[in-house]
């Protein structure tokens, strides 16, 4: 008949498993339970995936690996006494008197429960990496952490190459023995030890459990170090940069840590496993029963098969590893799990021209000299789209793309952003807001929803802020409804009249040129160059200023560039920016200075795009270390990442305007990076490409 093969990871666990199997058989519990011996939790997961075993209890990190790499699912969860249902919370604690926040942890002294432990290491380190605060190069998490904090106590890190930094705050026992041991010999080991490290002033932040402070303050601790401590003298660091009282851990934590859970193959009936274990716990979880499911004392060990602190086992409703782990823990694990042995030795960068090949070659050499990992290789392609194809086909790994190309890369080729560019504020031509400008007019005020029948001014046909974004946005919002993909006719019928300068006016609706004025002699009307006085962003604004149009679609800088004395041409010399307003998507109007909150879309910065199976944290980790050395255009290290002047080109590999590469943070998809408004505008336009 049916049997469930439990995987044990050690001799004591195999012993307990045998006893549990025997106890279940005696009690007539079906199906029968067998025990399979694995060498480790990882090995057991492989055995289950290979159908040589069926079930094992795993911690959060192992559940993540088992689910992501082997398709296993959690079906039964542990519940613990004194805990919050099937989970507890990982928190960061600081002294109330300090000024530390989650954003200022760089350089502070840190206290950890132990190396590779969930709340003391995995969650905080994973969270800092995933949120972009801590960059890791070449999967060397230990080095990254040792560089990031200003000294730490991480019990168990004494065997690593970075013990000087990671064990700097550890003190051992009263006689100085066992410094940095992952055992009670180290006074700063475990939850209470990490908190003690903070309380005694050795460290500035402690990564512990939600209950640790309350269990070790206000007279609850017998040891002398904790007797005078008050919980009110400590605070929690929240992910949004604020701080909170130590009792506020439900709202202010780094992650909710899931309980251990029993995992099985996707094709295994989770209900069957729960019924088996439920029968078992009903009979064998109380004191005095012949077999104790939730005790390991008889075997001289702890936490065999199940955690000893388990009070009951419960069925898991949504049997996916993502749902069980929760998004906070899941995100932290994404940041942490980086196997140096599985890290490709090379990052193959896509290049599109001879100057770009030259710069990429120099970048590869410069990075290699500084021992940056992974090493850069340069691979040619014919076009951005060809790059996308080659990345998808795993012939190349990365390329920097503009907004429209990011959209195609994400939507058509499944690529994701790994890092982004950031430009100085003066560089508003590289990333800017698209705005709808109107005259401030209280008597004839209209909103974005009331544009039908108005007169419109556009920089030119196909210009991002003058045409693509506003028209795309109006299509997406359902105001303009093209028939048979004829956008031009639809726009010409939506507005009463327009000026949309164009280079090829064949089959061009006359109303799209109706407001155009041409040059001083009235010639070259509606041409797509500066001979048409209403051409370009400046011209579109002039069209509004001179009352030819009611709305101008321009960049957020356009009004400022042509008012308050910034443009001395006669038409602009006396203009004041206060006389103009923006139309907002929510139906309101706003001051022209409020462009960041009132716009049709932001033209996004360029981003480095990769396959979704590429570890984005290693890509950003490489670029971040590289920009420390090569990012400043005045560096003396022999290569300039964000300057192309040595190669007789512009914007090679990265835009020259880039002042730094930034992590993507929560913008981990092409939609997230581009922003909903920009995507909506592109989708509005692309829906018409028949």
């Amino acid at each position: 008949g049916m049997e469930v093969r439990w995987c044990a990871t050690s001799d004591p666990e195999q012993h307990k498993c045998g006893n549990m199997s025997e106890a279940f058989r005696e009690a007539g519990i079906q199906p029968s339970l067998l025990c399979v011996r694995g060498t480790s939790a990882d090995h057991c997961v492989q055995l289950i995936a290979a159908q040589e075993a069926d079930a094992i209890t795993l911690d959060g990190g192992a559940i993540y690996e088992a689910g992501k790499e082997h398709g296993l699912k959690p079906v039964v969860g542990e519940v613990y006494d004194q805990e919050v249902g099937t989970s507890y919370y990982a928190v960061a604690v600081v002294r109330r008197s300090s000024h530390v926040t989650i954003d200022t942890l760089k350089g502070v002294k840190s206290c950890h429960t132990g190396i590779n432990r969930t709340v003391g290491w995995n969650v905080p380190v994973g969270y800092l990496v995933e949120s972009g605060r801590l960059s890791v190069m070449g999967c060397d998490v230990l080095k990254a952490v040792s560089d990031y904090f200003g000294g730490s106590c991480v019990p168990g890190a004494g065997e690593t190459s970075y013990s000087e930094s990671l064990c700097r705050l550890c003190r051992g026992d009263s006689s100085g023995e066992g410094v940095c041991d992952k055992s009670p010999l180290e006074r700063y080991y475990d939850y209470s030890g990490a908190f003690r490290c903070l309380a005694e002033g050795a460290g500035d932040v402690a990564f512990v459990k939600h209950s640790t402070v309350l269990e070790n303050t206000d007279g609850k601790t017998l040891p002398s170090w904790g007797q005078a401590l008050l919980s009110q003298d400590f605070e929690l660091l929240c992910r949004d940069g604020s701080r909170a009282d130590v009792t506020e851990w439900r709202q202010c934590h780094l992650a909710r840590v899931p309980a251990h859970a029993v995992v099985v193959r996707a094709d295994t009936d989770g209900g069957l496993i729960f019924r088996l274990l439920n029968e078992g716990q009903r009979l064998f979880s109380h004191e005095g029963s012949s077999f104790q499911m939730f005790s390991s004392e008889a075997y001289g060990q702890k936490d065999l098969l199940f955690k000893d602190s388990t009070s009951e086992l419960v069925p898991i409703a949504t049997q996916t590893y993502e749902a069980w782990l929760g998004h906070e823990y899941l995100h932290a694990m994404k940041g942490l799990l980086c196997d140096p042995n599985r890290l490709p030795p090379y990052l193959r960068w896509c290049v599109l021209s001879t100057p770009e090949i030259q710069k990429c070659g120099d970048m590869a050499v410069a990075f290699r000299r500084q021992r940056l990992k992974p090493e850069i290789q340069c691979v040619s392609a014919k076009s951005p789209q060809h790059c996308m194809e080659r990345i998808q086909a795993e012939q190349v790994d990365a390329v920097t793309l503009s907004g429209e190309d990011i959209y195609t890369a994400g939507k058509t080729y499944g690529l994701v952003p790994a890092a982004g560019e950031h430009y100085a504020p003066e560089d508003s031509s590289n990333s800017y807001y698209v705005v709808a400008v109107v005259r401030r007019d209280s008597s004839h005020a209209f909103t974005l929803d009331e544009l039908r029948g108005k007169r419109s001014c556009h920089a030119g046909f196909g210009s991002p802020a003058g045409w693509d974004v506003p028209v795309g946005a109006l299509i997406q919002r359902g105001f303009i409804r093209p028939k048979d993909c004829d956008v031009l006719t639809a726009v010409s019928e939506f507005f009463n009249a327009s000026c949309v300068p164009v280079n090829n006016p064949k089959n061009y609706p006359s109303s799209l040129c109706a407001l155009c004025v041409g040059d001083e002699q009235g010639r070259n009307k509606c041409v797509g160059n500066s001979q048409e006085r209403y051409y370009g962003y400046r011209g579109a604004f002039r069209c509004l200023v001179e009352n030819a149009g009611d709305v101008a679609f321009v960049r957020h800088t356009t009004v400022f560039d042509n008012t308050n004395g910034h443009n001395s041409e006669p038409w602009a010399a006396e203009l004041r920016s206060e006389d103009y307003e923006l139309l907002c998507p929510n139906g309101a109007r706003a001051e022209v200075s409020q462009f960041a909150a009132c716009n049709l879309a932001q033209i996004p910065p360029h981003a480095v795009m990769v396959r979704p199976d590429t570890n984005i944290f290693t890509v950003y980790g490489l670029l971040d270390k590289a920009q420390d050395l090569f990012g400043d255009d005045h560096n003396k290290n022999g290569f300039k990442m964000f300057d192309s002047s040595n190669y007789h080109g512009q914007d090679l590999l990265f835009k020259d305007a880039t002042v730094r590469a930034v992590p993507v943070g929560e913008k981990t998809t092409y939609r997230g990076w581009l922003g909903l408004d920009y995507v909506a505008a592109l989708e509005g336009m692309s829906s018409q490409q028949c």
Epitope: P425, D427, D633, V662
Partner: antibody
């Protein structure tokens, strides 16, 4: 009217961390760029860095390994942390705003706070 | 970094006189977008710097029209047509065309 006010300790010990707060009234730190500048004895001004409306930071490369600028939008405050200070960091520290209206010149400054690094 | 050199270091003037301060950049301050991000500040004794002129020649709100800025490329000038007592202090030029922004060393305007 836009006003910025710096606050923080006037004396910091060498190797410690200098922490300053800039409290802003009359404008929201969720628009524009919010900067730190310092002035050394003898009048030399040095630009330190900014935090943008979207929370992105830029730091002067000469300070990059030691500086951190953060913000708390709920309090309309932003902060400067400078680690491992030495006597060379003795200066008057200013916070200032940059917006498009003046093409990102620093149009409003705090009154400054004098910081001495000494044991 | 881009070096901004101001001359003179000190400028003694009589009230009512014209004053002229020069600022020279080590490289052109014309940005790729065509703008020139050269600004002038005045720091009165015991106060913080205040913006006078932005983008070469634009007076900030509230700044009297006796202040004017000019120049292009690498050479820029601030002129005060008739110096008043409230104009005394240290004048700084600053560029933000290139990152990081940099300041000149200052010119002290004082009474003769």
């Amino acid at each position: 009217e836009v006003q910025l006010q710096e606050s923080g300790p006037s004396l910091v010990k060498p190797s410690q961390t200098l922490s300053l707060t800039c409290s802003v009234t009359g404008d929201s730190i969720t628009s524009g760029y919010w900067n730190w500048i310092r002035q050394f004895p003898g009048n030399k001004l040095e630009y330190m860095g900014y935090i943008s409306d979207s929370g992105i930071t830029y730091y002067n490369p000469s300070l990059k390994s030691r500086i951190s600028i953060t913000r708390d939008t709920s309090k309309n405050q932003y902060y400067l942390q400078l680690n491992s200070v030495t006597a060379e960091d003795t200066a008057t520290y200013y916070c200032a705003r940059r917006t498009l209206a003046t093409y990102y010149a620093m149009d409003y400054w705090g009154q400054g706070t004098s910081v001495t690094v000494s044991s | 970094d881009f070096v901004m050199t101001q001359t003179p270091l000190s400028l003694p003037v009589s009230l009512g006189d014209q004053a002229s301060i020069s600022c020279r950049a080590s490289q052109s301050l014309v940005h790729s977008n065509g703008n020139t991000y050269l600004h002038w500040y005045l720091q009165k004794p015991g106060q913080s710097p205040k913006l006078l002129i932005y983008r070469v020649s634009n007076r900030f709100s509230g700044v009297p029209d006796r202040f004017s800025g000019s120049g292009s490329g690498t050479d820029f000038t601030l002129k005060i047509s008739r110096v008043e007592a409230e104009d005394l202090g240290v004048y700084f030029c600053s560029q933000s065309t290139h990152v990081p922004p940099t300041f000149g060393g200052g010119t002290k305007l004082e009474i003769k």
